[in-house]
């Protein structure tokens, strides 16, 4: 496939309260179950409808979970990670990495490799500049009428 797929990588702290149906999401990954090549991290594979995570709205399928209640999820067996979530208590703090796909060239898919991202300002600055130019041109056009 031609073109390069880049990602905007942002991190967020998400505090969930375990609801009547639990935290309400599934995970994949771990040292014994790599979801992304060369990455044994823990990823969200499914969010349960009307569960705590879905109602909160911030956690997304494909997000990488970096820590649970301050405990790092690096180099964990899959089941050890599962147990960590299950025993995390009523109030659960998640450090999460979101990856927003930024398309360069032909349309691709959300890849399972290359976790590299680009800084948010590299996208926002040109967008802001274009918006300002468009607004200026529009005002000039209206003045000429």
């Amino acid at each position: 496939m031609n073109g390069r797929v880049d990602y905007l990588v942002t991190e967020e702290e998400i505090n969930l309260t375990r609801g009547p149906s639990g935290l309400g999401f599934n995970i994949v990954g771990g040292t014994d179950q790599q979801y992304v090549s060369n990455d044994s991290g823990i990823y969200v594979s499914r969010i349960k409808e009307n569960g705590a995570a879905a109602l909160d709205g911030r956690l997304q399928e494909g997000d990488k979970i970096l820590s649970v209640n301050g405990q790092d999820l690096k180099n964990l067996l899959h089941q050890d990670a599962v147990d960590l979530f299950r025993n995390a208590g009523y109030a659960v703090s998640l450090r999460v990495q979101h990856r927003l796909q930024v398309q360069n060239g032909p349309i691709g898919h959300r890849g399972e490799g290359d976790p590299s991202g680009i800084p948010i300002f590299m996208v926002l600055v040109p967008v802001f500049a274009l918006t300002m130019v468009a607004a200026w041109a529009f005002m000039r056009y209206r003045q000429q009428l």
Epitope: P20, G22, N26
Partner: nanobody
Amino acid sequence: QVQLVESGGGLVQAGGSLRLSCAASGRTLMRYTMGWFRQAPGLERDFVAEISWSGGNTGYADSVKGRFTISRDNAKNTVYLQMNSLKPQDTAVYYCAAVIGSPTDYSDYRSSLDYDYWGQGTQVTVS
């Protein structure tokens, strides 16, 4: 997509045994949590048992603990439910189910909303 086909149901006398099988096609069951549910006429679909992707962790409904055993063979892409000491109240249509990943909650919380892929069911009747 994952396609699931159950087999092994039938008519059995109280106290007897049955072994249900669920064969998956379309995708390997690695990374999938597998479960069994059952539905009696006019009632909701209830959780019976589930097994983690590796087979290392299992969970059961209180009503079947000590009588039913769930297992899996990832090489054969198949999940099993061994049912012993069957009771008339075990009569139902039994469904196999699959979902990607591992739920971050214990199976006490489990409902049909936790699973995405379903078989067509196999009837179990205990007389």
